[in-house]
């Protein structure tokens, strides 16, 4: 098989027929050196998953529930291309899971017990995970095994792919519980047919199923949707009456050597030639010999899943947790004031050492999780491996786009009521050596620049945003002759000035000596022409306040600020000579952890905050010898946000807009992944 062949996995005779047609039609439109299709037939989706993992096939389209199974070891598959619904202009990478009933049946969502149920398939999203996830904790005990509990709840079911021997009631309405289209009640259209034929009382499907199966409005009017407020609505009101929004079906491939670029190349060309309204002789999103063959008939096209996105990120924390809870039989305990330990995310070695010290001193209230970059930390918080960390505003933006929320803000000024009064922010400045007297904001081109890190507020978003408005392109590495902007591509001129050794060069963590505020200032002192930092950086590292050899003899008077009007001012005049006001760093977490992170951190700062006077013999949360480990060293307290409890409200409209403009220049793979899920 040539290397440019994608072996597509088909799960029925009808799918295999469509796959062969797909193969032949692609041959006719794609040059011989382009991607080609080969077809592999298996008995079920699970067999396809195993075949791909074993390198006997390369790709299959799966429901989100099965994407989770495909991701689990030993399969280790990942989503690579997603179907989208809606239109090309407004593509939706989700659909609605709904409960369809006949109009005259007269029961509500909270009266499903004893009814007959029709499911698309065991472990599938709209047909199983969502409805059973909603019903599960209301099921009578014992709830394990899950299939038995469901079988006892309904008076009869068709749940294709269930074990008919162990759980015959789940196959009562579709003898055999076959796991492919050989079973007339399999899949979306099958589950709807189960309801239509009168075998079942309720069908758990997707919002478009009824439209795809009943072209006539009068026929559709014989059906209704069950809503979560225990009412019913007409089938076209699914946006106001659904069980959940489910991530769209997606093509999966191996995580390693999975041909993901080739699969995308193939499908992208396929949608160009055979997508919606493209060709009469073969249509990718149509199934003349059945329904939803290879791809969903309701799909409008494909979108490439960002490479950073694994299955957990694609499905989202809520869905993964719902599936886990369902499979493990976990139901909520009665609410309690007890908080589980907060898992703090520490960046690289230095932060981990401080975090471990914190953990010991907290007596089990804080646990530590490590990651190499801020983005890796954010991803860990998203998927539940970690719970919280304190972030620069630029990363608060990314975290917010990824669904996290700010919970407390760092405050840098001493005040009587520090914890109750979040500050307006700090100043982003451009520092130069006084001796370079001809340097101004207007002639920075070709100079050597020092940045805290790519994506951070004072070091990147603010100065580069202003620069972008001036030069109208993103090639900042061409604007400056060289520089150190940790997090840049290693071969970029913006890594040339960095001092990290080997693999640590230009890394966005403390292993790179020029990382962060202090690092960027050190870069200016030793190699650069301009440093983009915060207004406190120069005084914090001069006049003997930083004892490190490179800093101990520095004098604040030897540095000046660049003002946007082309003038320069002394460092202490930052209030009249800055680039912009930056939002303070803030602690972020997931919504479900918000209350506990808030509570535990407030306890922790009362024990280890700035009220501790001797940090030589005691643990101090906000000290790390100017390294800004875990928190900025000039933090006085962590303050309540009051109503500024979303990333937009916290950062403010102006900053969100500025970072939004700079998104065109973003190299953040995480931001790309998160905006794929929530544009």
């Amino acid at each position: 098989v040539p290397d440019k062949t994608v072996r597509w996995c088909a799960v029925s005779e009808h799918e295999a027929t469509k796959c062969q047609s797909f193969r032949d039609h692609m041959k006719s439109v794609i040059p011989s050196d382009g991607p080609s299709v080969a077809c592999v037939k298996k008995a079920s989706y699970l067999d396809c998953i195993r075949a791909i993992a074993a390198n006997e096939a390369d790709a299959v389209t799966l429901d989100a529930g099965l994407v989770y199974d495909a991701y689990l070891a030993p399969n280790n598959l990942k989503p690579v291309v997603a179907e989208f619904y809606g239109s090309k202009e407004d593509p939706q990478t989700f659909y609605y899971a709904v409960a369809v009933v006949k109009k005259d049946s007269g029961f509500q969502m909270n009266q499903l017990r004893g009814k007959k149920s029709c499911h698309t398939g065991l472990g599938r999203s709209a047909g199983w995970n969502i409805p059973i996830g909603l019903l599960y904790c209301d099921l009578p005990e014992p709830r394990k095994p899950l299939e038995k509990a469901v079988a006892n709840f309904f008076s009869g079911s068709c749940a294709p792919c269930a074990d008919g021997t162990d759980f015959p009631q789940l196959c009562q309405l579709c003898p055999g519980c076959g796991c492919s289209t050989l079973n007339q009640y399999f899949g979306y259209s099958g589950a709807f047919k189960c309801l239509k034929d009168g075998a079942g009382d309720v069908a758990f499907v997707k919002h478009s199923t009824i439209f795809e199966n009943l072209a006539n409005k009068a026929d559709r009017d014989q059906y209704e949707l069950l809503c979560l407020d225990n009412t019913r609505k007409p089938v076209d009101e699914y946006k106001d009456c659904h069980l959940a929004q489910v991530p769209s079906h997606t093509v999966v491939a191996r995580s390693m050597g999975g041909k993901e670029d080739l699969i995308w190349e193939l499908l992208n060309q396929a949608q160009e030639h055979f997508g919606k309204d493209k060709s009469k002789e073969f249509q990718l999103f149509s199934s003349p010999h059945g329904k939803d063959l290879l791809f969903k008939d309701s799909a409008h096209g494909f979108l490439k899943v960002p490479p950073r996105m694994d299955a957990k990120m694609y499905l989202g924390y809520e869905y993964v947790t719902a599936i886990r809870n369902l499979r493990e039989g976990t139901c909520p305990e009665a609410p309690t004031d007890e908080c589980k330990p907060v898992k703090w995310c520490a960046l690289s070695h230095h932060e981990r050492l401080k975090c471990d010290e914190w953990s010991v001193n907290s007596v089990g209230k804080i646990e530590c999780v490590s990651a190499e970059t801020t983005e890796d930390c954010i991803a860990k918080i998203m998927n539940g491996e970690a719970d919280a960390m304190s972030l620069d505003g630029g990363f608060v933006y990314i975290a917010g786009k990824c669904g996290l929320v700010p919970v407390l803000a760092e405050n840098y000024n001493k005040s009587d009521n520090c914890e109750d009064t979040p500050e307006a922010g700090y100043f982003a400045i451009a520092v130069v050596k006084k001796s370079a007297s001809d340097l101004t904001w207007d002639n920075l081109k070709g100079k050597k620049s020092c940045h805290t890190a790519v994506g951070r507020t004072a070091g990147w978003n603010i100065p580069m945003g202003l620069l972008y408005n001036k030069i109208n392109h993103c090639r900042f590495d061409e604007f400056f002759s060289e520089g150190c902007a940790p997090g840049s591509k290693k071969d970029s001129s913006l890594c040339k000035l960095c001092m990290g050794s080997g693999l640590n060069l230009c890394e966005p963590n403390n292993k790179e000596g020029y990382y962060g505020y202090t690092g960027a200032f050190r870069c200016l002192v030793e190699k650069g022409d301009v440093a983009f930092v915060k207004h406190q950086t120069v005084p914090q590292n001069t006049g003997g306040k930083n004892p490190d050899p490179w800093a101990k003899n520095l004098n604040e008077k030897d540095y000046e600020l660049l003002c946007l009007d082309g003038t320069r001012k002394p460092v202490e005049e930052y209030a009249n000579c800055h680039l912009a006001r930056a939002p303070n760093h803030a602690v972020v977490t997931r919504k479900d952890k918000e209350a506990c992170v808030h509570k535990i951190l407030r306890q922790q700062q009362h024990l280890f905050g700035s009220n501790v006077t001797d940090c030589s013999g005691n643990f101090c949360l906000f000290r790390s010898e100017t390294k800004d480990l875990l928190f900025r060293d000039d933090t006085v307290c962590l303050a309540k946000l009051h109503d500024r409890n979303t990333y937009e409200k916290y950062l403010g409209e102006e900053y969100v807009k500025a970072v939004g403009n700079l998104r065109k220049c973003s190299t953040s793979s995480l931001l790309e992944a998160c905006t794929f899920r929530r544009p």
């Epitope: 904790c137 209301d138 979560l228 407020d229 225990n230 659904h242 959940a244 989202g316 669904g403 479900d592």
Partner: nanobody
Framework: QVKLEESGGGLVQAGGSLRLSCAAS????????MAWYRQAPGKERELVAG???????NYADSVKGRFTISRDNAQNTMYLQMNSLRPEDTAVYFC??????????????????WGQGTQVTVSS
């Protein structure tokens, strides 16, 4: 969305009783558990008692044996029977509902919902 409305608060003498109600409306089928919280002036909000749809309960130590939480699933209402009230029970009492994980998939539901609160004042 879920809307929560508290009622039953008021002024009562120490040793007296009150019964708070919390009526839930909207997507009540998404609710996994409900709770009563309270906040006294100048203090943090604290949990008083919680209950799941299955009926398991939990109480703060300070109210154990005096307060009873209950739920009428058919009426979508939660209650807090407060006996032997003390001046330190004076606070605004809030109703809270936490949603089921499956209901939150794709951002379909919030993590939790809160009522506006009802004032309970216990005079000595």
């Amino acid at each position: 969305q879920v809307k929560l409305e508290e009622s039953g608060g008021g002024l009562v003498q120490a040793g007296g009783s009150l019964r708070l109600s919390c009526a839930a409306s909207g997507n009540v089928f998404t609710i996994a558990a409900m709770a009563w919280y309270r906040q006294a002036p100048g203090k943090e909000r604290e949990l008083v008692a919680g209950i799941t749809t299955g009926g398991s309960t939990n109480y703060a130590d300070s109210v154990k044996g005096r307060f009873t939480i209950s739920r009428d699933n058919a009426q979508n209402t939660m209650y807090l029977q407060m006996n032997s009230l003390r001046p330190e029970d004076t606070a605004v009492y809030f109703c809270n509902a936490v949603t089921k994980w499956a209901a939150r998939v794709g951002g379909s539901a919030e993590y939790e919902y809160w009522g506006q609160g009802t004032q309970v004042t216990v005079s000595s």
